[in-house]
């Protein structure tokens, strides 16, 4: 990542400490998962990519942050509240729910580095975990005890 402008510590700095500082708390995505606001159809296609052929189809929504590497991440957004029938590809089956599958991805944030007396010394990359929704899966509803 050294091609990012001023991203690297000054000479003599310990890169293992300054460049990669762990934070184990996953950063939530910019927006929570929400019902689809755009009129893309709740149906399983017979061809096309996996996300449109799935019985829990989803679309991808861009999450861009220019102070993060990677700058572009894509979050899955379920197109249907329930699973789609394998037979018709269009009728929803209320016996199954369409739910997001999450993954904690390692990302790096660009942060100002500070010298011994609080002076600004370029930028450091801070390693974080970031929660990304990868796909929607068809699951049996939880039975509340």
């Amino acid at each position: 990542y050294s091609h990012w402008p001023s991203c690297c510590p000054s000479k003599g700095q310990d890169t293992s400490e300054e460049l990669l500082r762990w934070s184990t708390v996953p950063v939530p995505p910019l927006e929570p998962a929400r019902p689809n606001r755009h009129p893309e159809s709740c149906r399983a296609s017979e061809d096309g990519p996996l996300n449109s052929r799935a019985i829990s189809p989803w679309r991808y929504e861009l999450d861009r942050d220019l102070n993060r590497l990677p700058q572009d991440l894509y979050h899955a957004r379920c197109l249907c509240p329930h699973c789609v029938s394998l037979q018709t590809g269009s009728h929803m089956d209320p016996r199954g729910n369409s739910e997001l599958l999450y993954h904690n991805q390692t990302v790096f944030y660009r942060r100002p580095c500070h010298g011994e007396k609080g002076t600004h010394k370029g930028y450091c990359l801070e390693r974080r975990l970031y929660r990304v929704s990868l796909a929607c899966v068809c699951v049996r509803p939880r039975v509340m005890g």
Epitope: H3, H38, N51, E61, L62, L66
Partner: antibody, heavy 122, light 107 residues
Framework: EVQLVESGAEVKKPGASVKVSCKAS????????MNWVRQAPGQRLEWMGL????????SYNQNFKGRVTLTRDTSASTAYLELNSLRSEDTGVYYC???????????????WGQGTLVTVSS | DIQMTQSPSSLSASVGDRVTITCSAS??????LNWYQQKPGKVPKLLIY???SLHSGVPSRFSGSGSGTDFTLTISSLQPEDVATYYC?????????FGQGTKLEIK
């Protein structure tokens, strides 16, 4: 040579929908994000949204309140803009624009379609 | 959304003049700013990206500068073919937003 060719002018009634196409050639269609920008008569350029043709990922300008849908057909190297619930204020020229990206510093619309004039009138 | 404001809205200058257009962002956008040129009845064209980098094929009389909230587009020696409307655009945060444009005419 990179080219973006948009569909022809449209005249629509208020409440109707319009679908504009943008056929790309001269580059790898799935390798570049496609933006859609509107220009109402005498107004500033207004960004409507973008689509990544590789995975269909989108980002929309919420000012359009969910009336915009962006799709693509990778086999035809074509991006589509659909705008629903049209009103007279939607009259304007609609441009598709390819977005160049260097990986860390810039995102810039380097090639533009010729524009599609959409007129909304009763 | 980040608001972009250009000044002046229009200006008239003579061939050979040095012309300056400014663009102000409602919050800091680092150097994440592009400039576009739109000639009358034509499609917008990318002029400058990342505040100061000239797009390929753009004459060297065009230059850009600034950082944070205040940016400048300069034409060192105005030519007749520079008659156009110029727009700044931020890409620091989605949604992308444009300035209202500066219409440049020849005296």
């Amino acid at each position: 040579e990179v080219q973006l060719v948009e569909s022809g002018a449209e005249v629509k009634k208020p409440g109707a929908s319009v679908k504009v196409s943008c056929k790309a050639s001269g580059y790898s269609f799935t390798g570049y994000t496609m933006n859609w920008v509107r220009q109402a008569p005498g107004q500033r350029l207004e960004w409507m949204g973008l689509i990544n043709p590789y995975n269909g990922g989108t980002s929309y300008n919420q000012n359009f309140k969910g009336r915009v849908t962006l799709t693509r057909d990778t086999s035809a190297s074509t991006a589509y803009l659909e705008l629903n619930s049209l009103r007279s204020e939607d009259t304007g020229v609609y441009y598709c624009a390819r977005e160049d990206y260097d990986g860390y510093l810039y995102f810039a619309m380097d090639y533009w379609g010729q524009g599609t004039l959409v007129t909304v009138s009763s | 959304d980040i608001q972009m404001t250009q000044s002046p809205s229009s200006l008239s200058a003579s061939v050979g003049d040095r012309v300056t257009i400014t663009c102000s962002a409602s919050q800091g956008i680092s150097n994440y700013l592009n400039w576009y040129q739109q000639k009358p009845g034509k499609v917008p064209k990318l002029l400058i990206y990342y505040t100061s980098s000239l797009h390929s094929g753009v004459p060297s009389r065009f230059s850009g500068s600034g950082s944070g909230t205040d940016f400048t587009l300069t034409i060192s020696s105005l030519q007749p073919e520079d008659v156009a409307t110029y727009y700044c655009q931020q890409y620091s945060k989605l949604p992308y937003t444009f300035g209202q444009g500066t219409k440049l005419e020849i005296k």
